[in-house]
């Protein structure tokens, strides 16, 4: 349905408030270093222009594409060259190359100051003084730090952010009310950003087919009662939504996501029995709820898959006629029967099935060749099962902090070239799999753990892609999306690594560590642990444990001392000497 004016169409569909918010997010995700005020000015200009197009769709420039309109607007920024360097060269290009150029310059790790939370009273005053600016600032700060954040979902976060301040700034104990809510939003926001980053990486690095396969598997687990045709329709629509958001087309993305939620709710009888509550909510909550809805119960009587996918004499005929449809049906049928498998495992099984058919359908006796195909699945299923069992046992034995430390050591030995902050961030997140997933019964552990690990390892991949330093990381990240985790798991100690020169400065600590939160203190200790392993990659667990125990005792002792700074200086020298001796440095 072609519209004379795309900008007018989206303005009318979304309404002014959502339109302005989405344009702000889009601009902040592209120009991550621009001041807030500059972005607000650009957004207001675009909004005023959109209103003229709503009044008269034939008005000048109203027929231009959104990429053209937004790109032209971004290219009016005076400081583009000095702030962004070569990104300014994008402005010399025509659409669609210009937008592709902007996308390529999105920075997953922008050099921006950490967001420091002001005092509660200060925040409440700012909220009451100018609620609109306060909420816009939230969108801006999140969007520029997370350039792939799922825009319609960010609107949902902003709505919850506003609700938290509305409620808590009137409460007797503002801090007790507000801070837990802000912590929850922060943690959920980071998780949401990382999950979306994987979807965009899947689309951009591995293509639409890879994303569609992921979506078939996940939606079939979630909606096992839905017919294959229904799941296929949802997959097609969902792919369009995420392609748009990952491509910076945030207005189209939000509009199409709303349409998809509407369709799902209108057809819930043929999709899932679990959607009723979601579909009674307002739009933003509804879309979020549908995205998180629990798996429906499996139909009572699903037959074995052998008949259609192994025993049938028509397997090769059906495969040859429509390969992706047949493989899609295989994936759908397997996934709806296995909510206990991770999506990546299901995709590995489908890939094995595809490879077998490719080989066997060209053989003299195809049926004889593929008859034992599902015997090949056994090791693929058992590998993640065993890995999760071992790691959950380790987590239960060590607790989260020490489990993270074990992973820090493991991953630093595998890929010691990776920067220390990245190793700390990724290993800490990998370690959270324990508290997130090990509490679940066996039937829910694998989908929880392995699909979460896919999200975390994608963080490593996108951060490493910015400044590649390890061929092993590049190999694991680029060869196969579904085999990333097994690829990293299989890495042994990097024998080619030349240990880092010892630098006492790295292990010199000051009294300011005492004022840090427990989490920040842990990060400092874990940073030191990574550096230790980089100096001495062959250090044993026992050696590292001894040094880390000494280090913890040293911090505790000096933080209790009257003259903390002197304690850190004197005891620090002793600790460094003792650590060098213990590790044979």
């Amino acid at each position: 349905d072609a519209h004379k004016s795309e900008v007018a169409h989206r303005f009318k569909d979304l309404g002014e408030e959502n339109f302005k918010a989405l344009v702000l997010i889009a601009f902040a995700q592209y120009l991550q270093q621009c001041p807030f005020e500059d972005h607000v000015k650009l957004v207001n200009e675009v909004t005023e222009f959109a209103k003229t197009c709503v009044a008269d769709e034939s008005a000048e420039n109203c027929d231009k594409s959104l990429h053209t309109l937004f790109g032209d607007k971004l290219c009016t920024v005076a400081t583009l060259r000095e702030t962004y360097g070569e990104m300014a060269d994008c402005c010399a290009k025509q659409e669609p190359e210009r937008n592709e150029c902007f996308l390529q310059h999105k920075d997953d790790n922008p050099n921006l100051p950490r967001l420091v939370r002001p005092e509660v009273d200060v925040m409440c005053t700012a909220f009451h003084d100018n609620e609109e600016t306060f909420l816009k600032k939230y969108l801006y700060e999140i969007a520029r730090r997370h350039p792939y954040f799922y825009a319609p979902e960010l609107l949902f976060f902003a709505k919850r952010y506003k609700a938290a301040f509305t409620e808590c700034c009137q409460a007797a104990d503002k801090a007790a009310c507000l801070l837990p809510k802000l912590d929850e939003l922060r943690d959920e926001g980071k998780a949401s950003s990382a999950k979306q980053r994987l979807k965009c990486a899947s689309l951009q690095k591995f293509g639409e087919r890879a994303f569609k396969a992921w979506a078939v598997a996940r939606l079939s687990q979630r909606f096992p009662k839905a017919e294959f045709a229904e799941v296929s329709k949802l997959v097609t629509d969902l792919t369009k939504v995420h392609t748009e958001c990952c491509h910076g087309d945030l207005l189209e993305c939000a509009d199409d996501r709303a349409d998809l939620a509407k369709y799902i709710c209108e057809n819930q009888d043929s999709i899932s029995s679990k959607l009723k509550e979601c579909c009674e909510k307002p739009l933003l909550e509804k879309s979020h709820c549908i995205a998180e809805v629990e798996n429906d119960e499996m139909p009572a009587d699903l037959p074995s898959l052998a008949a259609d996918f192994v025993e049938s004499k028509d397997v090769c005929k059906n495969y040859a006629e429509a390969k992706d449809v047949f493989l899609g049906m295989f994936l759908y049928e397997y996934a709806r029967r296995h909510p206990d498998y991770s999506v990546v495992l299901l995709l590995r099984l489908a890939k094995t099935y595809e490879t077998t058919l490719e080989k066997c359908c060209a053989a003299a006796d195809p049926h004889e060749c593929y008859a034992k195909v599902f015997d090949e699945f056994k090791p693929l299923v058992e590998e993640p099962q065993n890995l999760i069992k071992q790691n959950c046992e380790l987590f239960e034995q060590l607790g989260e902090y020490k489990f993270q430390n074990a992973l820090l050591v493991r991953y630093t030995k595998k890929v010691p070239q990776v920067s220390t902050p990245t190793l700390v961030e990724v290993s800490r997140n990998l370690g959270k799999v324990g508290s997130k997933c090990c509490k679940h019964p066996e039937a829910k552990r694998m989908p929880c753990a392995e699909d979460y690990l896919s999200v975390v390892l994608n963080q490593l991949c996108v951060l490493h892609e910015k400044t590649p330093v390890s061929d092993r990381v590049t190999k694991c990240c680029t060869e196969s999306l579904v085999n990333r985790r097994p690829c990293f798991s299989a890495l042994e100690v990097d024998e080619t690594y030349v240990p880092k020169e010892f630098n006492a400065e790295t292990f010199t600590f000051h009294a300011d560590i005492c004022t840090l939160s427990e989490k920040e203190r842990q990060i400092k200790k874990q940073t030191a642990l990574v550096e230790l392993v980089k100096h001495k990659p062959k250090a044993t667990k026992e050696q590292l444990k001894a040094v880390m125990d000494d280090f913890a005792a040293f911090v505790e002792k000096c933080c209790k001392a009257d003259d903390k700074e002197t304690c850190f200086a004197e005891e620090g020298k002793k600790l460094v000497a003792a650590s060098q001796a213990a590790l044979g440095l």
């Epitope: 009572a300 009587d301 074995s304 052998a306 029967r337 206990d340 699945f377």
Partner: nanobody
């Protein structure tokens, strides 16, 4: 947790019949695919038969098709294997298994719970 206990095994002559039972406790079996496997002396465990949750679908290994019948009574929380026209090569330890999620009924990795087994000996 589902506990499975097999019974009904024994010694029988070639051509004879036996009916194995698999009684489940700890959970209702109506949400599980039930299967029978066997291990002959010195051989690997092999699939025999399986039945879907409601009993609407049954699936057999080629070697037992037409001779063995799998059934279930969800109200009694029990699965059965009726074995007719028994042969010496059917001699094995027979295991009952329950799988909450199952795509390939014939694959042991698809089953979550296993019994200890009941011995069937076919000999003249």
């Amino acid at each position: 947790e589902v506990q499975l206990v097999e019974s009904g095994g024994g010694v029988v002559q070639p051509g004879g019949s036996l009916r194995l039972s698999c009684a489940a406790s700890g959970s209702t079996i109506s949400s599980y695919v039930m299967g029978w496997f066997r291990r002959a002396p010195g051989k690997e465990r092999e699939f025999v038969a399986a039945i879907s949750r409601s009993g609407g679908y049954t699936y057999y290994a080629d070697s037992v098709k037409g001779r063995f019948t799998i059934s279930r009574d969800n109200s009694k929380n029990t699965a059965y294997l009726q074995m007719n026209s028994l042969r010496p090569e059917d001699t094995a330890l027979y295991y009952c298994a329950a799988g909450r999620y199952s795509a390939w009924y014939s694959q042991s990795y698809e089953y979550d719970y296993w019994g200890q087994g009941t011995l069937v000996t076919v000999s003249s």
